[in-house]
């Protein structure tokens, strides 16, 4: 028996662009709380008990109200640890799901409203009694920093909390073959911890830290299959526990990767690339099933009835990602044509069109000159989304209604004098200069 402890250090916007300012607002104050779900990291774990190792809910954190203009801080967190007691042996490898929830404290009818802000999941190897392990996980634009450990509750001790420490005064109950371990003479040592990474399927150990292979397997962690056909030479090295040690055609022969994983050889053994929903050395573990509710934003979870089958989230319009966790930036596809401004309203897209264009995507080019008259003999020129008048000499302005002073722009160079004329302008050039604008 023992307790898994989780300490949340910070929750806030992650690095990089697009990070949210805050889950709360000046109009809608809120506070955070966390939920942790633990599962033993074994592929056969039943799906009907999604948190088979246990679950815990934190207290509510302090109320937070965003200050407009202030930089986005890490959000105030609940006090204390999240503690998940476990009754049996600590499994050593476990899956976790940590959810960050927001409690909105506005004027909701019927009390506060809760919504899931972020969910992170992972699989870790952890010995009970060890130091705190630190971790950083990102969920969308959010970042969660936390530490965790597993500790045994007296009288249990050991990396799995399966050894019982008895008082020295109690008579020894160590069975044959179980040696007492120092410093308590009456403490019985039962389970062996094999070498870290020793294949759970093809390895075994008689001594702590050992990794011996079943016949047909080799390598330091018993992950490499042996081809006995390559041992025809009597001089070929062989062993009682490993069979023939000469490696066969390759460690990926027979594809050791489960659940549709693809195998690639590495210098020392092999590596599995797992399909969505699976992980582990051989893709044998599915950490999250539909029972865990992995689909955000109203996504529909299908498949994944048990940990050996991957789940798939069917996302509602406007969301994407394997867990429907990403809002689709539909404006990034630039659906508004002719320079229209795109507005994503969540439930719909709206285009705000420039003058001279219309339609849901600003696809219609309006006749800019329709119903437009240019005064004083000017002619209408269509284009650029707005009508323009080409005015007769002596007139200007949008509709050629203003009498133009052709000398206002001082068109005569080198000190030439400008005179307005009915047909335009005339430059009287200074001595030594010539040309229509005295430019020579």
């Amino acid at each position: 028996a023992g307790v898994f402890e989780l300490q949340i250090h910070s929750f806030g916007p992650g690095p990089g662009p697009g990070a949210p300012r805050s889950p709360c607002s000046a109009r809608l104050p809120c506070r955070l709380f966390f939920r942790v779900c633990l599962k033993p990291g074994l592929s056969e774990e039943a799906a009907e008990s999604p948190c088979a190792l246990g679950a815990a809910l934190s207290a509510r954190g302090p109320v937070y109200t965003e200050q407009p203009g202030a930089p986005a801080p890490d959000l105030p967190l609940p006090d204390g640890l999240l503690q998940v007691p476990f009754r049996d042996a600590w499994p050593g490898t476990f899956s976790f799901i940590i959810e960050t929830w927001r409690e909105e404290l506005g004027d909701q009818i019927g009390g506060p409203a809760w919504s899931l802000l972020a969910r992170v999941a992972g699989r870790r190897r952890l010995a009970a009694g060890g130091p705190w392990a630190r971790d950083i996980q990102r969920a969308g634009a959010w970042e969660l920093r936390f530490s965790y450990r597993a500790r045994c509750e007296p009288p249990a001790v050991g990396t799995a909390c399966t050894r019982l420490c008895r008082p020295r005064s109690a008579p020894s109950r160590c069975g044959p073959g179980l040696r007492p371990c120092a410093p308590l003479e009456d403490e019985c040592e039962a389970p062996l911890v094999c070498r870290a990474g020793c294949s759970p399927e093809h390895g075994f150990c008689e001594q702590p830290g050992e990794c011996r292979c079943l016949e047909g397997w080799t390598g330091p962690l018993c992950t490499v299959p042996v081809s006995t056909s390559s041992c025809l030479s009597p001089r070929g090295p062989s062993s009682a526990t490993t069979g023939c040690l000469v490696p066969g055609p390759g460690p990926c022969d027979g594809n050791p990767c489960a659940n549709g994983g693809s195998c690639s050889e590495t210098p020392r053994s092999f590596e599995c690339t797992c399909p969505r929903g699976f992980y582990g050395l051989r893709c044998e573990v599915s950490g999250v099933t539909c029972a865990d509710g992995p689909c955000f934003n109203g996504g529909l979870c299908v498949g994944g009835a048990d940990p050996d089958s991957a789940y798939i989230c069917h996302c509602p319009p406007g969301f994407q990602g394997s867990n429907c966790e990403k809002r689709v930036d539909r404006c990034s596809l630039q659906p508004c044509r002719n320079g229209g401004l795109c507005l994503d309203l969540g439930h719909a897209l709206r285009c705000r069109c420039r003058a001279g264009f219309a339609g849901p995507r600003c696809e219609h080019d309006l006749d800019d000159c329709a119903g437009r008259a240019c005064a004083n003999g000017g002619t209408c020129v269509e284009g650029g989304g707005a009508h323009r008048c080409s005015c007769a000499l002596g007139f200007g302005g949008r509709d050629c209604r203003e009498r133009a002073d052709p000398c206002a722009a001082r068109p005569c160079a080198h000190g030439g004098r400008c005179y307005a004329h009915f047909s335009g302008l005339v430059c009287a050039c200074a001595p030594g200069y010539m040309g229509a604008r005295c430019e020579f």
Epitope: S43, A89, P191, L192, V193, A196, E201, C205
Partner: nanobody, 116 residues
Framework: QVQLAESGGGSVQAGGSLRLSCAAS????????LGWFRQAPGKEREEVAI????????HYRSSVKGRFTISQDNAKNTVYLQMNSLKPEDTAMYYC?????????WGQGTQVTVSS
């Protein structure tokens, strides 16, 4: 606490049969495998037969294939080893073992002696 208790060992003439039983208790998580190992005097411990508890698939040492059969009774949490056509070289201490993630558990063993 995981406990494995073997029974069914004994002495038999070459060509005879024995059935070993291993009763497992004290755990709630499914093991990776349950199996039978043996160790003859002066030799290394070696696996005889393994049953993968999730899938029910089996693994046999090449020298016992066709003679020994491993099976499990999930309701009783017991694994069996049916040994037929026994040979003198099968003489050894037979141990029941269980693998849970990185942990190995062993029973106390039961002696099998095959005389010619």
């Amino acid at each position: 606490q995981v406990q494995l208790a073997e029974s069914g060992g004994g002495s038999v003439q070459a060509g005879g049969s024995l059935r070993l039983s291993c009763a497992a208790s004290g755990y709630t998580y499914t093991s990776n495998w349950l199996g039978w190992f043996r160790q003859a005097p002066g030799k290394e411990r070696e696996e005889v037969a393994i049953i993968y508890t999730g899938s029910g698939s089996t693994h046999y040492r090449s020298s016992v294939k066709g003679r020994f059969t491993i099976s499990q009774d999930n309701a009783k949490n017991t694994v069996y080893l049916q040994m037929n056509s026994l040979k003198p070289e099968d003489t050894a201490m037979y141990y029941c073992a269980a693998r849970f993630s990185e942990y190995n558990y062993w029973g106390q063993g039961t002696q099998v002696t095959v005389s010619s």
